[in-house]
Protein backbone atom coordinates (compact mmCIF):
# COMPACT_ATOMS: atom_id res chain seq x y z
CA UNK A 1 0.00 0.00 0.00
CA UNK A 2 1.78 3.74 -0.40
CA UNK A 3 0.63 6.47 1.45
CA UNK A 4 -0.72 9.69 0.09
CA UNK A 5 1.62 12.62 0.06
CA UNK A 6 -0.19 15.96 0.73
CA UNK A 7 1.23 19.44 1.03
CA UNK A 8 0.15 21.87 3.33
CA UNK A 9 0.80 25.49 1.71
CA UNK A 10 0.92 28.70 4.52
CA UNK A 11 1.98 32.00 3.87
CA UNK A 12 3.86 34.40 5.15
CA UNK A 13 4.94 38.10 5.27
CA UNK A 14 9.00 38.15 6.36
CA UNK A 15 10.91 41.31 7.04
CA UNK A 16 14.30 41.34 6.58
CA UNK A 17 17.11 43.86 7.16
CA UNK A 18 19.72 44.09 5.02
CA UNK A 19 23.40 42.64 6.62
CA UNK A 20 26.79 43.37 5.66
CA UNK A 21 26.85 40.64 2.85
CA UNK A 22 23.32 41.68 1.89
CA UNK A 23 20.10 39.07 2.28
CA UNK A 24 21.78 36.09 2.17
CA UNK A 25 20.06 33.64 0.01
CA UNK A 26 19.77 32.73 -3.91
CA UNK A 27 16.99 32.27 -5.94
CA UNK A 28 15.91 30.31 -8.95
CA UNK A 29 13.14 30.75 -11.36
CA UNK A 30 11.60 33.04 -13.72
CA UNK A 31 9.92 33.10 -17.30
CA UNK A 32 13.03 31.94 -18.77
CA UNK A 33 14.19 29.39 -16.14
CA UNK A 34 11.03 27.20 -14.83
CA UNK A 35 12.12 25.70 -11.58
CA UNK A 36 9.05 23.98 -10.74
CA UNK A 37 7.12 22.15 -13.70
CA UNK A 38 4.23 25.09 -15.48
CA UNK A 39 5.23 27.52 -12.88
CA UNK A 40 7.37 29.98 -13.86
CA UNK A 41 7.62 31.45 -10.13
CA UNK A 42 10.85 32.47 -8.09
CA UNK A 43 12.39 30.09 -5.65
CA UNK A 44 14.41 29.68 -2.75
CA UNK A 45 17.20 27.75 -3.51
CA UNK A 46 20.20 28.15 -0.62
CA UNK A 47 20.14 30.20 2.43
CA UNK A 48 23.57 31.08 2.95
CA UNK A 49 24.94 30.55 6.74
CA UNK A 50 25.16 33.59 9.07
CA UNK A 51 23.51 35.72 6.40
CA UNK A 52 20.67 38.00 7.28
CA UNK A 53 18.12 35.31 5.96
CA UNK A 54 19.92 32.84 8.40
CA UNK A 55 19.51 34.67 11.19
CA UNK A 56 15.68 35.85 11.19
CA UNK A 57 15.65 31.92 10.63
CA UNK A 58 11.73 31.83 8.91
CA UNK A 59 12.89 32.01 4.94
CA UNK A 60 13.56 28.23 4.32
CA UNK A 61 15.24 26.58 0.99
CA UNK A 62 12.41 25.33 -1.26
CA UNK A 63 10.26 28.83 -0.14
CA UNK A 64 8.08 30.31 -3.05
CA UNK A 65 8.68 34.34 -2.84
CA UNK A 66 5.58 35.98 -4.37
CA UNK A 67 6.62 39.65 -3.71
CA UNK A 68 9.31 41.70 -2.50
CA UNK A 69 8.11 45.33 -1.17
CA UNK A 70 4.70 44.50 -2.13
CA UNK A 71 5.66 44.36 -5.86
CA UNK A 72 4.61 41.04 -7.33
CA UNK A 73 7.46 38.45 -8.72
CA UNK A 74 4.81 36.78 -11.19
CA UNK A 75 6.11 36.69 -14.97
CA UNK A 76 9.50 37.80 -14.58
CA UNK A 77 12.61 36.58 -16.25
CA UNK A 78 15.31 35.44 -14.06
CA UNK A 79 18.31 38.00 -14.18
CA UNK A 80 14.97 40.82 -13.07
CA UNK A 81 13.95 38.56 -10.49
CA UNK A 82 17.73 39.11 -9.08
CA UNK A 83 17.64 42.63 -10.13
CA UNK A 84 14.92 43.48 -7.69
CA UNK A 85 16.21 42.15 -4.84
CA UNK A 86 19.16 43.82 -4.89
CA UNK A 87 17.39 47.15 -5.59
CA UNK A 88 15.14 46.43 -2.71
CA UNK A 89 16.80 48.67 -0.18
CA UNK A 90 17.88 48.17 3.43
CA UNK A 91 14.40 47.21 4.62
CA UNK A 92 12.90 44.43 2.65
CA UNK A 93 9.94 43.02 3.07
CA UNK A 94 9.19 39.28 1.78
CA UNK A 95 5.82 37.53 1.16
CA UNK A 96 6.45 33.57 0.83
CA UNK A 97 5.00 30.66 0.38
CA UNK A 98 5.93 27.72 2.59
CA UNK A 99 5.33 24.09 1.15
CA UNK A 100 5.29 21.46 3.75
CA UNK A 101 4.82 17.84 2.85
CA UNK A 102 2.84 16.33 5.09
CA UNK A 103 3.02 12.26 5.08
CA UNK A 104 -0.45 10.20 5.71
CA UNK A 105 -0.92 6.70 6.27
CA UNK A 106 -1.35 3.92 3.92
CA UNK A 107 -4.59 4.35 2.18
CA UNK A 108 -7.76 2.02 3.55
CA UNK A 109 -5.11 2.12 6.85
CA UNK A 110 -7.23 4.19 9.54
CA UNK A 111 -5.83 3.99 13.33
CA UNK A 112 -8.41 4.18 16.14
CA UNK A 113 -9.02 7.93 15.88
CA UNK A 114 -8.29 8.85 13.17
CA UNK A 115 -10.19 11.53 10.90
CA UNK A 116 -12.24 9.19 8.14
CA UNK A 117 -11.61 11.99 5.71
CA UNK B 1 26.64 15.10 -3.03
CA UNK B 2 28.11 17.54 -5.16
CA UNK B 3 31.69 16.69 -6.86
CA UNK B 4 33.85 19.26 -8.90
CA UNK B 5 36.78 18.11 -10.89
CA UNK B 6 39.30 20.13 -12.59
CA UNK B 7 41.68 19.50 -15.29
CA UNK B 8 42.99 20.40 -18.65
CA UNK B 9 46.27 22.92 -16.91
CA UNK B 10 49.55 22.52 -17.59
CA UNK B 11 52.55 24.28 -18.76
CA UNK B 12 51.92 26.88 -20.99
CA UNK B 13 54.06 29.62 -23.45
CA UNK B 14 53.62 33.48 -23.36
CA UNK B 15 51.20 34.28 -25.57
CA UNK B 16 49.48 30.58 -25.96
CA UNK B 17 46.21 29.05 -25.15
CA UNK B 18 44.62 26.14 -23.06
CA UNK B 19 41.67 25.24 -21.81
CA UNK B 20 40.27 24.19 -18.46
CA UNK B 21 37.23 21.73 -18.15
CA UNK B 22 35.30 21.76 -14.76
CA UNK B 23 33.28 18.30 -14.61
CA UNK B 24 30.23 18.15 -11.91
CA UNK B 25 28.71 15.22 -10.74
CA UNK B 26 26.21 15.08 -8.09
CA UNK B 27 24.02 18.07 -9.37
CA UNK B 28 21.71 19.18 -12.41
CA UNK B 29 24.31 21.77 -13.84
CA UNK B 30 21.01 23.49 -15.56
CA UNK B 31 20.39 25.46 -12.13
CA UNK B 32 23.74 26.15 -11.09
CA UNK B 33 25.99 29.10 -11.16
CA UNK B 34 29.83 28.09 -11.94
CA UNK B 35 32.99 30.56 -11.20
CA UNK B 36 36.44 29.90 -12.10
CA UNK B 37 38.67 31.39 -9.66
CA UNK B 38 42.51 31.68 -9.37
CA UNK B 39 45.06 31.66 -6.40
CA UNK B 40 48.50 32.81 -7.22
CA UNK B 41 51.43 31.77 -4.70
CA UNK B 42 51.35 34.52 -2.26
CA UNK B 43 48.16 36.23 -3.00
CA UNK B 44 44.67 35.55 -2.65
CA UNK B 45 42.31 33.69 -4.72
CA UNK B 46 40.48 35.86 -7.37
CA UNK B 47 37.45 35.24 -9.16
CA UNK B 48 38.32 35.09 -13.29
CA UNK B 49 35.47 34.40 -14.93
CA UNK B 50 31.63 32.41 -13.98
CA UNK B 51 28.47 31.88 -15.74
CA UNK B 52 25.26 31.91 -13.80
CA UNK B 53 22.08 29.72 -13.71
CA UNK B 54 20.60 31.37 -17.24
CA UNK B 55 24.23 31.17 -18.69
CA UNK B 56 25.03 35.10 -18.32
CA UNK B 57 28.82 35.09 -18.71
CA UNK B 58 31.34 37.39 -16.30
CA UNK B 59 34.66 38.57 -16.46
CA UNK B 60 37.31 40.28 -14.37
CA UNK B 61 38.84 43.40 -16.97
CA UNK B 62 42.47 41.72 -16.91
CA UNK B 63 41.07 38.65 -18.62
CA UNK B 64 38.60 40.57 -20.93
CA UNK B 65 38.68 39.85 -24.65
CA UNK B 66 41.32 36.56 -23.93
CA UNK B 67 39.44 34.63 -21.26
CA UNK B 68 36.06 32.77 -22.78
CA UNK B 69 33.68 30.67 -20.63
CA UNK B 70 30.74 28.29 -21.97
CA UNK B 71 29.09 25.40 -20.37
CA UNK B 72 27.77 21.97 -21.93
CA UNK B 73 24.90 20.60 -19.49
CA UNK B 74 24.68 17.72 -21.42
CA UNK B 75 28.16 16.89 -20.66
CA UNK B 76 27.87 18.51 -16.91
CA UNK B 77 31.01 20.66 -17.92
CA UNK B 78 31.87 24.40 -17.86
CA UNK B 79 35.04 25.11 -19.78
CA UNK B 80 37.34 28.35 -19.68
CA UNK B 81 39.23 28.70 -23.30
CA UNK B 82 42.46 31.21 -22.16
CA UNK B 83 44.35 32.75 -25.08
CA UNK B 84 47.04 35.17 -25.40
CA UNK B 85 48.40 34.05 -21.88
CA UNK B 86 50.79 36.63 -20.24
CA UNK B 87 53.18 34.89 -17.21
CA UNK B 88 50.79 36.91 -15.00
CA UNK B 89 47.51 34.26 -15.22
CA UNK B 90 50.28 31.47 -13.74
CA UNK B 91 48.23 30.30 -10.86
CA UNK B 92 45.69 27.35 -9.43
CA UNK B 93 42.62 28.16 -11.28
CA UNK B 94 39.78 26.39 -9.50
CA UNK B 95 35.61 26.28 -10.47
CA UNK B 96 33.41 26.50 -7.54
CA UNK B 97 29.53 26.14 -7.79
CA UNK B 98 26.73 27.61 -6.39
CA UNK B 99 22.89 26.86 -6.36
CA UNK B 100 20.67 29.59 -8.44
CA UNK B 101 21.80 33.47 -8.24
CA UNK B 102 22.61 35.24 -4.95
CA UNK B 103 20.18 38.01 -4.23
CA UNK B 104 23.25 39.71 -3.12
CA UNK B 105 26.25 40.02 -5.67
CA UNK B 106 27.20 38.30 -9.06
CA UNK B 107 28.57 34.92 -9.42
CA UNK B 108 32.02 36.66 -9.50
CA UNK B 109 32.38 36.86 -5.55
CA UNK B 110 33.65 33.62 -4.29
CA UNK B 111 31.94 34.39 -0.68
CA UNK B 112 29.53 33.21 -2.69
CA UNK B 113 30.60 29.70 -2.94
CA UNK B 114 30.10 26.18 -0.63
CA UNK B 115 31.41 23.96 -3.62
CA UNK B 116 34.93 24.13 -4.69
CA UNK B 117 37.25 21.60 -6.97
CA UNK B 118 41.05 20.73 -5.77
CA UNK B 119 42.14 23.07 -8.69
CA UNK B 120 44.88 22.60 -11.37
CA UNK B 121 47.67 24.40 -12.31
CA UNK B 122 48.21 26.88 -15.14
CA UNK B 123 51.85 27.87 -15.96
CA UNK B 124 52.64 30.81 -18.36
CA UNK B 125 56.61 30.73 -18.44
Known amino acids: MNGRVDYLVTEEEINLTRGPSGLGFNIVGGTDQQYVSNDSGIYVSRIKENGAAALDGRLQEGDKILSVNGQDLKNLLHQDAVDLFRNAGYAVSLRVQHRLQVQNGPIGHRGEGDPSG | DVQLVESGGGLVQPGGSVRVSCVSS????????IGWFRQAPGKEREGVSC???????YYVDSVKGRFTISRDNAKNTVYLQMNSLKPEDTAVYYC????????????????????WGQGTQVTVS
Open chain 2, 51 to 57: IDSVGRA
Open chain 2, 26 to 33: GFILDYYA
Open chain 2, 96 to 115: AADFGSSVDSTCLNNQQYDD
